[in-house]
């Protein structure tokens, strides 16, 4: 089936926005006013995954770029990266597992759990302008809760 996608931005629970930091990295920082135009717009695609009544599998691409967030092992540690793909073949309904995140909604906040690495989540640091990463803890120092803003 044709994959259904929507455009959105994400902010962490501290209201930090996500921006590009170099060609293959995202960072989280507070933005205001015109600077908000720097934030990345995601193309969130609803894909096949181990869907449950609480978890919706999605892929997170960067709008108008052939880049997707993916989860891989680097030095034996689950790691978040931006991966370049062939735009002729992506997005697709049947994404490879490394591209899939389980979108979990709790109390109007969203978490994004890696399908490849259960219990690892898209995370930001408390500190400003630090890279977005894959973290293995919830409810600790690092932030795993996000809000989503729809973009037309």
């Amino acid at each position: 089936a044709p994959v259904r996608s929507l455009h959105c931005t994400l902010r962490d629970a501290q209201l930090k926005s996500l921006v590009m930091s170099g060609p293959y990295e995202l960072k989280a920082l507070h933005l205001q006013g015109q600077d908000l135009e720097q934030q990345v717009v995601f193309s969130m695609s609803f894909v096949q995954g181990e869907e449950s009544n609480d978890k919706i599998p999605v892929a997170l691409g960067l709008k108008a770029k052939n880049l997707y967030l993916s989860c891989v092992l680097k030095d034996d540690k689950p790691t978040l990266q931006l991966e370049s793909v062939d735009p002729k073949n992506y997005p697709k309904k049947k994404m490879e597992k490394r591209f899939v995140f389980n979108k979990i909604e709790i109390n109007n906040k969203l978490e994004f759990e890696s399908a490849q690495f259960p219990n690892w989540y898209i995370s930001t640091s408390q500190a400003e302008s630090m890279p977005v990463f894959l973290g293995g803890t919830r409810g600790g120092q690092d932030i795993t809760d996000f809000t989503m803003q729809f973009v037309s």
Epitope: A1, Q48, E50, E51, S52, K94, M95
Partner: antibody
């Protein structure tokens, strides 16, 4: 060789809870999902829900409030519990293995158990 | 949810006949259609999995075609052991949904 076998009481009283077990061999429950399907006598197939390798569950909406699927990986067993049963829940209940092939066929079902008939009657 | 419309609900045919069953889905499911055969007192047996793929050990007289919303299952030359009930199943999205079944009887 992949095998699934359903077991449980063949007779359940109305308003009680129907409990079934699916014992599997030839594959690991931590790697593959298992679905439950039922078939009322002389009727078609109805998909009830599934449990994934990681333990997450998906329940079909009409039964969501009454259905619980759980598993014990070490015993290679998946269980189904359906509460507050009525005569309409009389059916042959099947468990089936999901293909769970990422990027190809995640949701298809390839191997089925023989099924067990459950009658709801007082 | 994806609704399935399978037809006909029953069919009488003779050994050697060519038989066709159709399944129409309410949403585009790409090629994620499966076909099962069920005999009385037995569980359904997967004949053809998504992508119109014949399962190992299934005779080549069984075939399927289609993508999107329109799907066809064909038995090219009916054999006595083929008289059974056939079901389509979409595996594109949850909840999984079956067609109503086609009972194939001897004419």
């Amino acid at each position: 060789e992949v095998q699934l076998q359903e077991s449980g009481p063949g007779l359940v009283k109305p308003s009680e809870t129907l409990s079934l077990t699916c014992t599997v061999s030839g594959f690991s429950l931590s790697d593959y999902g298992v679905s439950w399907i039922r078939q009322p006598p002389g009727k078609g197939l109805e998909w009830l829900g599934l449990i994934w390798g990681g333990g997450d569950t998906y329940y079909n909406s009409p039964l969501k409030s009454r259905l619980t699927i759980s598993k014990d990986n070490s015993k290679s067993q998946v269980s189904l519990k359906l509460s507050s049963v009525t005569a309409a829940d009389t059916a042959v209940y099947y468990c089936a293995k999901q293909r769970t092939l990422w990027g190809y066929d995640l949701y298809g079902m390839d191997y089925w158990g023989q099924g067990t008939l459950v009658t709801v009657s007082s | 949810d994806t609704q399935m419309t399978q037809s006909p609900s029953s069919l009488s045919a003779s050994v050697g006949d060519r038989v066709t069953i159709t399944c129409i889905t309410s949403t585009d499911i790409d090629v994620d259609m499966n076909w099962y055969q069920q005999k009385p007192g037995k569980p359904p047996k997967l004949l053809i999995s998504q992508g119109n793929t014949l399962r190992p050990g299934v005779p080549s007289r069984f075939s399927s075609s289609g993508s999107g919303t329109d799907f066809t299952f064909t038995i090219s030359s009916l054999q006595p052991e083929d008289f059974a009930t056939y079901y389509c199943l979409q595996s594109d999205n949850l909840p999984l949904t079956f067609g109503q079944g086609t009972k194939l009887e001897i004419k």
